[in-house]
């Protein structure tokens, strides 16, 4: 029986360009963590095997870093980055548990407005 | 589901090879990783190679390294571990597992026991 449960860092939200990092945690079981894989929208971004550490995908190489712990570090955040990311705990003997956070990158105010206004 | 059988365990003296064979079958969504497990008596599974789909990345504990080999045929839906230079400590039942984007199916293991 799965008894477990996952606690995420929920909706957030960043500022476009801007880092920030994803959250899940696993508590409740006794459960042996296998492997945590993270995903976007069925995109695969990064792997943490608890045995063998970390694997980011080639499209993602250069704006995912591990960490800290099983999270995941999003960089340079781009508008199209806004959507639904999951963590999913797989665990020997319950099976598969899973988490959802839904970031959104917001255009910087700064960026947005910062050129309307001249400093006398 | 994706079902794993797993062959190729069995009794080999230390020094020898065993070349193991995972292969799957059923809807297998989209495929992120294969892996390789093993379990010794009273002790914890603990993984010990791993490749992944998205650009055939290859990792290994250190108690395998420079002995053990993962491969992976696509078109066979198999992946194999070549084990080398076998010792008595690499005794266990060796699973096979996959994950994907739904979770992670494991194979029903073979063993293999090293001799001195």
């Known amino acids: 029986m799965m008894t477990g449960t996952i606690e995420t860092t929920g909706n957030i939200s960043a500022e476009k360009g801007g880092s920030i990092i994803l959250q899940c945690h696993l508590s409740s079981t006794t459960a042996q963590v296998t492997q945590v894989n993270w995903e976007q929208q069925d995109q695969l971004l990064a792997i943490c095997n608890a045995d063998l550490g970390w694997h980011i995908s080639p499209s993602f190489k250069d704006r995912v870093a591990p960490g800290p712990g099983l999270g995941l570090t999003l960089q340079s955040l781009t508008v199209n980055d806004t959507g639904e990311y999951f963590c999913i705990y797989h665990t020997y003997p319950d099976g598969t548990y899973t988490g959802r956070i839904f970031l959104e990158v917001l255009e910087s105010s700064v960026a947005e407005h910062g050129a309307r206004f001249q400093i006398p | 589901e994706v079902q794993l059988v797993e062959s190729g365990g069995g009794l080999v003296q230390a020094g020898g090879s065993l070349r193991l064979s995972c292969a799957a079958s059923?809807?297998?969504?989209?495929?992120?990783?294969m892996g390789w497990f093993r379990q010794a008596p009273g002790k914890e599974r603990e993984g010990i190679s791993l490749?992944?789909?998205?650009?055939?990345?290859?990792y290994y504990a250190d108690s395998v390294k420079g002995r053990f080999t993962i491969s992976a045929d696509n078109a066979k839906n198999t992946v194999y571990l070549q084990m080398n230079s076998l010792k008595p400590e690499d005794t266990a039942v060796y699973y096979c597992?996959?994950?994907?984007?739904?979770?992670?199916?494991w194979g029903q293991g073979t063993q293999v026991t090293v001799s001195s």
């Open positions: 490749i992944t789909s998205d650009d055939g990345s290859t």
């Open positions: 059923g809807r297998a969504f989209s495929l992120r990783t």
């Open positions: 597992a996959w994950t994907t984007n739904r979770g992670m199916d």
